[in-house]
């Protein structure tokens, strides 16, 4: 039975040209994390593998940095970066846990961080 929960940074906003950290945290399970995938809609951004380390997709290499931790840093943000981001935790023996983050990239300097929320 899958008992874990993923906490994410939730709905967040950031300024165009700036950077943002996408963070997920898996808790309430004894399962072992073997890999975390970061995706934007259906596009793979990066993989953090427990054994092999980080792999950033070639098309995002210039603007995506690994970490902190299992998180992902997006740099040089554009309005086109607005949208849904997913962290997908592959865990043994539970299976996959998915967290969702919505990022809004704003033209002005009124960007504020949204509240944290939980996804079961």
């Amino acid at each position: 039975m899958m008992t874990g929960t993923i906490e994410t940074t939730g709905n967040i906003s950031a300024e165009k040209g700036g950077s943002i950290i996408l963070q997920c945290h898996l808790s309430s399970t004894t399962a072992q994390v073997t890999q975390v995938n970061w995706e934007q809609q259906d596009q793979l951004l990066a993989i953090c593998n427990a054994d092999l380390g980080w792999h950033i997709s070639p098309s995002f290499k210039d603007r995506v940095a690994p970490g902190p931790g299992l998180g992902l840093t997006l740099q040089s943000l554009t309005v086109n970066d607005t949208g849904e981001y997913f962290c997908i935790y592959h865990t043994y023996p539970d299976g996959t846990y998915t967290g969702r983050i919505f990022l809004e990239v704003l033209e002005s300097s009124v960007a504020e961080h949204g509240a944290r929320f939980q996804i079961p």
Partner: antibody, heavy 122, light 107 residues
Framework: EVQLVQSGSDLKKPGASVRVSCKAS????????MNWVRQAPGHGLEWMGW????????TYVQGFTGRFVFSLDTSVNTAYLQISSLKAEDTAVYFC???????????????WGQGTMVTVSS | DIQLTQSPTFLSASVGDRVTITCRAS??????LAWYQQNPGKAPKLLIY???TLQSGVPSRFSGSGSGTEFTLTISSLQPEDFVTYYC?????????FGQGTKVEIK
Amino acid sequence: EVQLVQSGSDLKKPGASVRVSCKASGYTFTSYPMNWVRQAPGHGLEWMGWINTNTGNPTYVQGFTGRFVFSLDTSVNTAYLQISSLKAEDTAVYFCARTGGHTYDSYAFDVWGQGTMVTVSS
Amino acid sequence: DIQLTQSPTFLSASVGDRVTITCRASQVISSSLAWYQQNPGKAPKLLIYAASTLQSGVPSRFSGSGSGTEFTLTISSLQPEDFVTYYCQHLHGYPSNFGQGTKVEIK
């Protein structure tokens, strides 16, 4: 070469305890979960449970709670199975096996120890 | 718990034969299934994972198929060393059970 090497066969009396070791080499020990599997003479494979090599947290299958303890010593890349209050029905070959594969759909026990025969007899 | 039922339990065949072993799950397990080969007195050896992916170093005469609840292991042309026991295992959550085994014997 990725391998798991287990301790040798053991003959024990009922009521005694036994510890089986499983030494890993050729890979990052804490990156892969470790499982324990029992095979009684003439019988099939029985999953006993597993241990999270990252946190040391063990999980036991029903029927393998109480007398069975999984543990780790990450400094020497070794997993242990301890069985206390041994009974004749504990006579079996015990295997350690690594969970290979990185994604949920590719998990499998890809590397196995050679097995340790534990015989319980008075 | 998800139960796996292998059939047949015993299979008699000859060198060169094509044989198929079936593994049925008591509920849907997607493609989270592995097949192992075990020689007497030895540790099991992984043949197939993710229902159909051949493990590195395993001869191509072995193949796996299926998804959901029904899976098969096929040996296209039996070799003398293939007359041993085969197990399926699901890895769809906890607990990860094995089938009861299929022993392939020489006819």
